[in-house]
């Protein structure tokens, strides 16, 4: 009971997490305009993966695509490389682990497909979370690094000029959801991961037993010695017959010349 | 490479009127403002007037009423036509275009003298 919720828990909290990876790829606000100590208030400037927008004062919004692939930062390919890597495994994932969710049966799969599925979908997830959180955070470093290389120039110019004033970006909301959404796929490739341990077949158990014989006469029952699955009767490890066999806890030290091991 | 070239610049006297021109050539992404700016000598830049690619107009506060600020998008051309002008308006006047395309790129041109004197 416990495998089959930690496991459908992990499945809807990869699934959330994939979601907002999509969403967060999808956004336009990785990057606001900074407004501080900015002249220029008559439009504000907010960017995406894929484009750039401008809402003026008006009120008017026009949103352009960035046709251009040469021009772009090498940064920015990475980082939209590192978010559809992180989409299609974890759709990948998704797909996998819904024939693996216990509560679903599929013809007459094994518990051994099932948790070996898991375990696929479950490392999908987690690669999937790590691409999500690394894009995000290659584009946070990318937006510190050309906010201070605007200050830096703010403050100096080129030649007595200020050269940018308007160029500073901050952080968009888009981040905040990539780096959640990244974190919680993460978590729920770790839950399938967890799910997976128990959902293996347990191996079977042959507990040792000594026999300890106290006479001649003691006749053999065939069918006394049982493997216990933990599932069975004998699940204490009780004695099954009494013609001398004792369990390991049962077992006594005195010495015997009829003793056999 | 965007190259901006202004022209219009020179001596007035107060009260008098001038009209200022830069014309862009080359590739602008279709998102931008162009305007212009004015730096005195031992001053900090100083906003004049900036029009949007979207029909927004924006002035600084020392030239509102006085001056206005038009723009051709065929042309990729920005006018500022300065009325009433006053010593305090002598300036190098620098003609910006900033485009808002990823994290944003600014031009600017050589810029041109204004020199407002009896």
């Known amino acids: 009971m416990a495998v089959t919720a930690c496991q459908g828990l992990g499945f809807v909290v990869s699934l959330i997490g994939i979601a907002g990876i999509i969403a967060a790829t999808c956004m336009d606000q990785w990057s606001t305009q900074d407004l501080y100590n900015n002249p220029v208030t008559a439009v504000f400037n907010y960017q995406g993966l894929w484009r750039s927008c401008v809402r003026e004062s008006s009120g008017f919004t026009e949103c352009r695509g960035y046709f251009t692939l040469l021009g772009l930062p090498a940064m920015l390919q990475a980082v939209r490389a590192l978010m559809i890597v992180g989409i299609v495994l974890g759709a990948i994932g998704l797909l996998v682990s819904i024939f693996a969710l216990k509560c679903i049966r599929i013809g007459s799969m094994e518990d051994s497909a099932k948790a070996n599925m898991t375990l696929t979908s479950g490392i999908m997830f987690i690669v999937s979370g790590l691409c999500a959180i690394a894009g995000v955070s290659v584009f946070a470093n990318m937006l510190v690094t050309n906010f201070w290389m605007s200050t830096a120039n703010m403050y100096t110019g080129m030649g007595g000029m200020v050269q940018t004033v308007q160029t500073r970006y901050t952080f968009g909301a888009a981040l905040f959801v990539g780096w959640v959404a990244g974190g919680l796929t993460l978590i729920g490739g770790v839950m399938m991961c967890i799910a997976c341990r128990g959902l293996a077949p347990e191996e079977t158990n042959y507990k040792a037993v000594s026999y300890h014989a106290s006479g001649h006469s003691v006749a053999y029952k065939p069918g006394g010695f049982k493997a216990s699955t933990g599932f069975g009767s004998n699940t204490k490890n009780k004695k099954i017959y009494d013609g001398g066999a004792r369990t390991e806890d049962e077992v006594q030290s005195y010495p015997s010349k009829h003793d056999y091991v | 490479e965007v190259q901006l070239v202004e022209s219009g610049g020179g001596l007035v006297q107060p009260g008098g009127s001038l009209r200022l021109s830069c014309a862009a050539s080359?590739?602008?992404?279709?998102?931008?403002?162009m305007g212009w700016w004015r730096q005195a000598p031992g001053s900090q830049r100083e906003l004049v007037a900036i029009?949007?690619?979207?029909?927004?107009?924006q002035y600084g506060d020392s030239v509102k009423g006085r001056f206005t600020i038009s723009r051709d998008n065929a042309k990729n051309t920005v006018y500022l036509q300065m009325a009433s002008l006053k010593p305090e308006d002598t300036a190098v006047y620098y003609c910006?275009?900033?485009?808002?395309?990823?994290?944003?790129?600014?031009?600017w041109g050589q810029g041109t003298q204004v020199t407002v004197s009896l």
């Open positions: 910006n275009v900033h485009t808002y395309d990823f994290l944003g790129r600014d031009y």
């Open positions: 029009a949007t690619s979207g029909g927004s107009i």
């Open positions: 080359g590739s602008i992404f279709g998102l931008n403002f």
